[in-house]
């Protein structure tokens, strides 16, 4: 069964800056990745970035830099100034659309007791939806 993992990390240098890393554990070909916050995309969440493996990347403030890390994982840096900045208990979700598995989404947030610059190792988060 495919899985999605989500890792959220607060940067030590900028305490309101976050890095979200997401990956897809499956054998299919990824066609699109959508990163949102405040809940799953399409269920009250707000889209931060959409990454297509060939057509490019779209991102929206406070997203700072989205990029592909590998063929099956992405990272997104959020800047931490302004009214729309994330806070420590913000939930971030990643949805991977792949063929032939379909769409798989998981969410994560900053570990409760994490020190700045540290984060829990990337572990598969609960899969919220598999279309």
């Amino acid at each position: 069964t495919p899985e999605v993992w989500v890792q959220v990390r607060m940067e030590a240098t900028e305490l309101s800056s976050f890095t979200i890393r997401c990956g897809f554990l499956g054998s299919g070909s990824i066609s699109l990745v959508t990163v949102s916050w405040g809940g799953p995309n399409g269920a009250g969440g707000t889209t931060l970035a959409v990454l297509h493996p060939e057509r490019g990347i779209r991102q929206w403030a406070p997203a700072r830099q989205a990029r592909w890390e590998t063929q099956s994982s992405i990272s997104l840096i959020l800047e931490g100034s302004g009214a729309s900045s994330p806070c420590a208990n913000t939930t971030f979700c990643c949805k991977f659309a792949s063929f032939p598995e379909g769409s798989w989404e998981a969410c994560g947030s900053l570990p409760p007791s994490s020190d700045p610059g540290l984060s829990a190792p990337p572990t598969p988060a609960p899969i919220l939806r598999a279309d």
Partner: antibody, heavy 119, light 107 residues
């Protein structure tokens, strides 16, 4: 047919602000993105930023972040770009263009608005 | 930022000729490249997106090719109305960046 109609030329003083409008017609305004591009006389094109009128999402090129504010008015299907603290370097033609999220980038363009900054 | 380099600033050609305009990205942009034509005093016109897909209404003498870092816009059977500046754009990642442009001159 799809049209993007920009506001007329502006002559402004250094330090002042200007607001350029881009009125769209012929399509569903909230279903597409509006990109903004700068072109100085005889020079190339620079991407300023993009707004999603449907969600209100915005992204600015760092180079223009301090100077530029992008907004959109759904009721009039019009996008706006405000430039502040103008200097002679801001004298240019500014274009709006329509894109899709992952398709047909900059497919339709406005006619351009000439902004001249001069004392 | 990704730099898009159009090394040919000017190309001089004759009506009926075939001409190739090149664009090189400073890193891989997959197929996320578009091409635009700009005639004097006009706004740019979209020709090609996703490296090789022609926009609606663009004559088939305009052909785009390439992937990764090297891209080409080819105009076959050049017409006098093709006199213009041609720009490439990478839409792989923000900030989007344009090439410096290539001016096509008709002999």
């Amino acid at each position: 047919q799809v049209q993007l109609q920009q506001s007329g030329a502006e002559l402004v003083r250094p330090g002042a602000s200007v607001k350029v409008s881009c009125k769209t017609s012929g399509y569903a305004f909230t279903n597409y993105l509006i990109e903004w591009v700068k072109q100085r006389p005889g020079q190339g094109l620079e991407w300023i930023g993009v707004i999603n009128p449907g969600s209100g999402g915005i992204y600015y090129n760092d180079k223009f972040k301090v100077k530029t504010t992008l907004t959109a008015d759904k009721s009039s299907s019009t996008a706006y770009m405000q430039l502040s603290s103008l200097t002679s370097d801001d004298s240019a033609v500014y274009f709006c263009a329509r894109s899709e999220t992952h398709d047909t980038w900059f497919a339709y363009w406005g006619q351009g608005t000439l902004v001249t900054v001069s004392a | 930022d990704i730099v898009m380099t159009q090394s040919q600033k000017f190309i001089s050609t004759s009506v009926g000729d075939r001409v190739s305009i090149t664009c090189k990205a400073s890193q891989s942009v997959r197929i996320a490249v578009a091409w635009f034509q700009q005639k004097p005093g006009q706004s740019p016109k979209a020709l090609i997106y996703l490296a090789s897909t022609r926009h609606t209404g663009v004559p088939d003498r305009f052909t785009g090719s390439g992937s990764g870092t090297d891209f080409t816009l080819t105009i076959s059977n050049v017409q006098s109305e093709d006199l213009a500046d041609y720009f490439c754009l990478q839409h792989w990642n923000y900030p989007y960046t344009f090439g410096g442009g290539t001016k096509l001159e008709i002999k």
